[in-house]
């Protein structure tokens, strides 16, 4: 099980894994941009099961799933830190 | 050590009914969604569904949900599948996998198969 | 349904030699593969999940590779123990649907 807390840089993420989580799995995404004294992007995953895992930005299944997730919101103006519910 | 203990297989007549069983231990069984697949003599793997932790959520393969349901007794350890209106083609190798939601998300533990023989 | 096309029932090779077998997804199913072995008599044992990463305890001489719609399992040195069925399965939505196994024989 991977750690999610806040360190004093106030990055939450220990550990990071690339590994692919179905759809039918996650409740929801918390993307968090570079700053807000973090100085890394960071994906949090919620999961149903009530875990939460740290997911490496460069993960390609999770970037195919970002850049649906920008598809389906590029009529709204981006917010620094927002919550996607896969639906 | 993970063990899926099946039982329940044996020989049925067309149209019948028949109730497979799958025993959990060495895992906190009421965590985990688990799956039901078949191999039909000289065919391949056959998935028929699935069951989250809480029986909240049941998938079925379409074909299937019709005559097939699949429970479970978390205070047992127990996963279930009942088989109805069997027919001919049902014929099979019944496995129980548990299906990983914490780190494989895939089938990583399954049982050692319950022949099901549909005859008159 | 999305259906997972292995391009081969069976396939011949010799112990030492280096074998491929391909899997095809009718639809995008991201990196949510996985590769299974089933030996005659046996239960299907899980080798690789989400694509390339091998489960606990398989050796290094399985890889995987792939993602959307192209999967390739890989042994890079075919031991007698490893003469058996391979199936891929998509993992990315339900129904989970399996290929139809290529079979590792001997030459």
């Known amino acids: 099980v991977l750690e999610v807390y806040y360190t004093h840089l106030r990055c939450r993420c220990v550990q990071e894994s690339s590994v692919f989580i179905p759809r039918r799995f996650i409740d929801r995404i918390q993307i968090s941009p570079r700053g807000n004294g973090c100085p890394r992007k960071e994906i949090i995953v919620w999961k149903k099961n009530k875990s939460v895992v740290c997911v490496d930005p460069q993960a390609e299944w999770i970037q195919r799933i970002m850049e649906m997730l920008r598809k389906k919101s590029s009529s709204t103006p981006p917010v620094p830190v927002f919550k996607r519910k896969i639906p | 050590e993970v063990k899926l203990l099946q039982s329940g297989g044996g020989l049925v007549q067309p149209g019948g009914s028949l109730k497979l069983s799958c025993a959990a231990s060495g895992i906190d069984f009421s965590r985990y969604w688990m799956s039901w697949v078949r191999r039909a003599p000289g065919k391949g793997l056959e998935w028929i569904g699935e069951i989250n932790p809480d029986s909240s959520t049941i998938n079925y393969a379409p074909s299937l949900k019709d005559k097939f349901i699949i429970s479970r007794d978390n205070a047992k350890n127990t996963l279930y599948l009942q088989m109805s209106k069997v027919r001919s083609e049902d014929t099979a190798l019944y496995y129980c996998?548990?299906?990983?939601?914490?780190?494989?998300?895939?089938?990583?533990?399954w049982g050692q198969g319950t022949s099901v023989t549909v005859s008159s | 349904d999305i259906v997972m096309t292995q391009s081969h029932k069976s396939m011949s090779t010799s112990v030492g030699d280096r074998v491929s077998i391909t899997c095809k997804a009718s639809?995008?199913?991201?990196?949510?593969v996985a590769w299974y072995r089933q030996k005659p008599g046996q239960s299907p044992k899980l080798l690789i999940y989400s694509a390339s990463y091998r489960y606990t305890g398989v050796p290094d001489r399985f890889t995987g590779s792939g993602s959307g719609t192209d999967f390739t399992f890989t042994i890079s040195s075919v031991q007698a123990e490893d003469l058996a069925v391979y199936y891929c399965?998509?993992?990315?939505?339900?129904?989970?649907?399996f290929g139809a196994g290529t079979k590792l024989e001997l030459k």
């Open positions: 996998a548990r299906q990983d939601d914490y780190e494989y998300y895939a089938m990583d533990y």
């Open positions: 639809q995008d199913v991201n990196t949510g």
């Open positions: 399965q998509q993992y990315y939505s339900t129904p989970l649907t």
